[in-house]
């Protein structure tokens, strides 16, 4: 279970090449573990496969397999990153008929510096 807050190593292949290697669940969408997140992330992967934004893969990984650092912080994606990706990929999102999750609506995320991320308490819902 996830009653104790502990970072865990990333096992989702697509995200194993990210600059971070530890994560925590549940994520923003409430996915309970990495296997569920990987399946749900699959719906968005054509956006990455067609490279609609240079930041798409980073954003998807940070959203579905969030950064976990120092055993005490979970790091959601920053709003600016979200806005950039959504703007870049909007046409393709519509073309594929992809439903963008409410939890990933950019105005729900906080402005922050990607190098000094905002953190949130993993035991309370993050609304930004």
């Amino acid at each position: 279970g996830h009653s104790l807050f502990t970072c865990e190593p990333i096992t989702v292949p697509r995200c194993m090449k990210m600059a971070y290697n530890m994560t925590f669940f549940p994520n923003l969408m409430g996915h309970y573990d990495q296997s569920i997140a990987a399946v749900e992330m699959e719906h968005f992967l054509p956006l990455a496969n067609l490279e609609c934004s240079p930041n798409i893969e980073t954003f998807l990984c940070k959203a579905f397999v969030p950064t976990c650092i120092e055993q005490i912080h979970v790091v959601p994606p920053c709003r600016k990153l979200c806005e950039k990706v959504y703007s870049d990929c909007k046409k393709l999102i519509d073309t594929f008929g992809i439903r963008w999750p409410e939890e990933l609506e950019c105005d729900r995320l906080q402005y922050c510096d990607e190098t000094v991320p905002v953190t949130f308490d993993p035991h309370t819902e993050f609304l930004g």
Partner: antibody
Amino acid sequence: EVQLVESGGGLVQPGGSLRLSCAASGFTFSDHYMSWVRQAPGKGLEWVALVGYDGSQQFYGESVKGRFTISRDNSKNTLYLQMNSLRAEDTAVYYCNTGIPMLYWGQGTLVTVSS
Amino acid sequence: DIQMTQSPSSLSASVGDRVTITCRASQSISSYLNWYQQKPGKAPKLLIYAASSLQSGVPSRFSGSGSGTDFTLTISSLQPEDFATYYCQQSYSTPLTFGGGTKVEIK
């Protein structure tokens, strides 16, 4: 009425080049990824290349990579396929279409590579 | 690359028959699967997109189902104009790939 009209096909010798064009009308060209698909005589469909909305992204099938170049001119509503170093196995009818999904198709243009 | 395997490669059926064609992807493609119909000498025509969405203007006797790796195209009651070759195609990742086709012939 949506129309995609291919041109530029014909007979070419092995090692030669051809440039195919596809003139689009009846829809907002720049709102679609565009692609080329080919069909060798009596065979199935094979995807050749795909280009993004503004032409900055191109993707290619393994069999044509490094020989073919896909491009587009949104001001002219036209898609192109530059084919170099042609081989006998490139002989096919070439169709242009809206790439994702392949909703609108042209009637095709025949490319024959033979000596 | 994602391989798409269609079966059968051909089938004989009569008008009014229910026809089922299957398509299997070599890895999960979520629901990014399209079906096309092609008649001799003509360009393919999109029938179904996103695995189960019927393209506008396509008769409701055509339906698609499946997700992940296994997909099905069903023609509930075959009509004379349905004798053609059918192709599945994945748009999950490049290279975009087609199945080998299923030729539906008159019995």
